[in-house]
Interface confidence: medium
């Protein structure tokens, strides 16, 4: 059973599945200037039996400007664009779902694929969240979401994660350690609280940095 919605969006976070349940579909999307080859697959499908799962179909892209079919080549890592599903910075996750039966691993890239992969998940799929680079995770609980079926409808559980813009590397004068490590904050948190007098904010009603009013008549 396909999940009706996408996993929840967490501001400044990205999600990744460690592995994909059988029945998961991955759109064959091509980057700008390229298109699927004629009669090429619309999607890849995770299929398998009790002992082995793999992706059926292959995605292939060709230049929009030419009618020739390009051969499928796996690009070198430096050629690969960041993707929503592969932006996770840390390989360490609570569960290695790839070792579970009935799951496919992340499919290899194909030549000229789009920069973002679009998956169609099935019930039981778990995805893990992590803050994008430059943001620190403030956990309240599990940073994961599972697609569940309840009362005949699918829904994703809400990941307990907030990403803050305070970077661990930022250092301002007057910085001091937080006085407590209260509930809702990981004990391993080591970044400092910033309290400083040299960071000022001024507001002005302006279109530019000059103090002038910028108004637009309502159409």
């Amino acid at each position: 059973e396909l999940c009706d919605d996408d996993p929840p969006e967490i501001p400044h976070a990205t999600f990744k599945a460690m592995a994909y349940k059988e029945g998961t579909m991955l759109n064959c999307e091509c980057k700008r200037g390229f298109r699927r080859i004629k009669s090429g697959s619309l999607y890849m499908l995770c299929t398998g039996n009790s002992s082995h799962s793999s992706w059926d179909n292959q995605c292939q892209c060709t230049s929009s400007a030419t009618r020739n079919t390009t051969k499928q080549v796996t690009p070198q890592p430096e050629e690969q664009k960041e993707r929503k599903t592969t932006e996770m910075q840390s390989p360490m996750q609570p569960v290695d779902q790839a070792s579970l039966p009935g799951h496919c691993r992340e499919p290899p890239p194909w030549e000229n694929e789009a920069t973002e992969r679009i998956y169609h998940f099935v019930v039981g799929q778990m995805v893990y969240y992590q803050c994008v680079q430059g943001y620190r995770a403030l956990h309240r609980g599990p940073a994961e979401s599972v697609c569940k079926m309840t009362h005949g409808k699918t829904r994703w559980t809400q990941p307990q994660l907030i990403c803050t813009g305070e970077m661990e590397t930022s250092q301002f004068p007057g910085e001091e350690k937080p006085q407590a490590s209260p509930e809702g904050r990981p004990e391993s948190e080591t970044s400092c609280l910033v309290t400083t007098t040299d960071f000022q904010i001024q507001t002005e009603m302006a279109a530019t940095m000059e103090t002038s009013i910028f108004t637009t008549e309502y159409q």
Partner: antibody, heavy 105, light 107 residues
């Protein structure tokens, strides 16, 4: 009424891009109301449902300035508009002095 | 949205009094609560973050406590400069929401 206003918020002396900037307004004699916020380094803004479609929050990293534009102004938008450095769990620790916007016909 | 309900809306007190302000969240917000002080014509000032952590430079007569849905700001011995309006704010989930405010008045 019906026009738009754009309020700017310039930060100095800190790492502007790394922190969320929240916009909070306060109508005369009323409490504080969060309108939305942005983390400049990331660029994506979040808005309160009440203002969705009417407010646009942007940031210019090169000038360490955040902007809040409110359109289709009505008299009830008369308020003081504040920007603040928003550190999430650690609260809004640095505030602008506020900009008074008066909507009148 | 998470609603934050503050009580009382105003309190009259004298210098040296102990003042307690409560804030209730419509759902659990763990420790994601801050308190602010605002004086007329001025921007709010952060007093306490994470329920009970005192912001740098804030006098120790201010303290915060609570967890889950019920929180308290206490001023142990009210000083003349403490007459102001106080707001609680949750940052547990978007949209961020503030309490309605509690005005501390001179008796």
């Amino acid at each position: 009424p019906g026009s738009s206003v754009k309020v700017s918020c310039k930060a100095s002396g800190g790492t502007f891009s790394s922190y969320a900037i929240s916009w909070v307004r306060q109508a005369p004699g009323q409490g504080l109301e969060w309108m939305g916020g942005i983390i400049p380094i990331f660029g994506t803004a979040n808005y309160a449902q009440k203002f969705q479609g009417r407010v646009t929050i942007t940031a210019d990293k090169s000038t360490s300035t955040a902007y809040m534009e409110l359109s289709s102004l009505r008299s009830e938008d008369t308020a003081v508009y504040y920007c603040a450095r928003d550190k999430g769990y650690y609260g809004m620790d640095v505030w602008g002095q506020g900009t008074t916007v008066t909507v009148s016909s | 949205d998470i609603q934050m309900t503050q009580s009382p809306s105003s309190v009259s007190a004298s210098v040296g009094d102990r003042v307690t302000i409560t804030c209730r969240a419509s759902q659990g917000i763990s420790s994601w609560l801050a308190w602010y002080q605002q004086k007329p014509g001025k921007a709010p000032k952060l007093l306490i973050y994470a329920v009970s952590s005192l912001q740098s430079g804030v006098p120790s007569r201010f303290s915060g406590s609570g967890s889950g849905t019920d929180f308290t700001l206490t001023i142990s011995s009210l000083q003349p400069e403490d007459f102001a309006t106080y707001y609680c704010q949750q940052s547990y989930s978007l949209p961020l929401t503030f309490g309605g405010g509690t005005e501390v008045l001179i008796k």
